[in-house]
Interface confidence: medium
């Protein structure tokens, strides 16, 4: 009988572990959905507001290929930076390639010099993985240098020609990105 109880207890524990795993997956999925939703809203807002405007990028935004970039002139913490970008129908910069990184760092040198600029990269609290705002992982060559010793949430930023990491609650400039309008001509 004792063996039977022990077996039942082990089965229950296994079930509990599976449920916890499922809950963790669901939480991750929910987080990803929320970000995707914000992303879609930003894209829609950008498309609608730009429909009346013939130029590929709004005033004060820089164009490179299919993207428009806005280099902020104000400081904010990482989360507020993301909110600010969303208000403009954009998101924090997502660097897809070395070419894009080179363009950004080259532009920053011309505009402002070697300040710190938040980008849309943050470290997942559980796994420690770096994730862009759309839930994708950065390519191996675009992982932040481990610079932050922070116990708090860690986010990515660009300085000079490097991608670095810092406590998300520190104040920095930031860079927003949105799709450039395709010319209808």
């Amino acid at each position: 009988k004792l063996l039977q109880v022990s077996t039942i207890a082990m089965q229950q524990q296994e079930k509990l572990i599976q449920q916890e795993r499922a809950l963790l997956n669901f939480t991750e999925w929910k987080r990803s959905c929320a970000l995707q939703m914000k992303y879609c809203q930003a894209f829609m807002q950008n498309s609608l507001s730009s429909a009346h405007n013939s130029s590929p990028c709004p005033n004060n935004w820089i164009q490179n290929r299919e993207s428009c970039y806005y280099v902020s002139e104000i400081w904010s913490i990482w989360h507020t930076s993301q909110e600010n970008c969303l208000k403009e129908g954009s998101t924090l910069l997502q660097i897809e390639s070395k070419e894009e990184m080179d363009f950004i760092t080259g532009s920053l040198r011309k505009i402002k010099g070697s300040y710190d600029y938040w980008v849309g990269l943050s470290q997942d609290g559980h796994s420690g993985r770096w994730l862009w705002q759309d839930g994708s992982s950065p390519s191996p060559g675009l992982l932040p240098a481990e610079r932050s010793q922070s116990a708090n949430q860690v986010c990515g930023y660009v300085k000079s020609n490097s991608l670095l990491s810092s406590n998300c609650s520190t104040w920095k400039y930031f860079i927003c990105e949105k799709y450039a309008l395709r010319s209808s001509v």
Epitope: N60, S72, E73, I74, W75, S76, N84, K87, E88
Partner: nanobody
């Protein structure tokens, strides 16, 4: 066009205090977050403190926390920076800035603060 004029800078001994003022004209600044930044010789401009439009939220750079206090008087369209326990490393030109995302960054001409040991 908004104009920001900083005043209250000067020379002071380490441990001393100064109160900087930033008077705005041409625009009511009560709707905007405001910030103080500073630039020391040969260094980049750095964030010092920020205050929300209503004045209920403030943030400070780690280097000035507990020593500097940012405040505002919306009726006077003015922002203040009370600087206590000043250190030689606080020597810089101090600028006041409207934190209005999406529009050009308005900043004053700055006021010099010199702290000697």
């Amino acid at each position: 066009q908004v104009q920001l004029v900083e005043s209250g800078g000067g020379s002071v001994q380490a441990g001393g205090s100064l109160r900087l003022s930033c008077a705005a004209s041409g625009r009511t600044i009560s709707n905007y977050d405001m910030a103080w930044s500073r630039q020391a010789p040969g260094k980049e401009r750095e964030f010092v403190a920020r205050i929300s439009g209503s004045g209920d939220r403030t943030d400070y750079a780690d280097s000035v926390k507990g020593r500097f206090t940012i405040s505002r008087d919306n009726a006077k369209n003015t922002v203040y920076l009370q600087m206590n326990s000043l250190k030689p490393e606080d020597t810089a030109i101090y600028y006041c800035q409207i934190q209005d995302f999406g529009s050009p960054s308005f900043s004053g001409q700055g006021t010099q603060v010199t702290v000697s040991s």
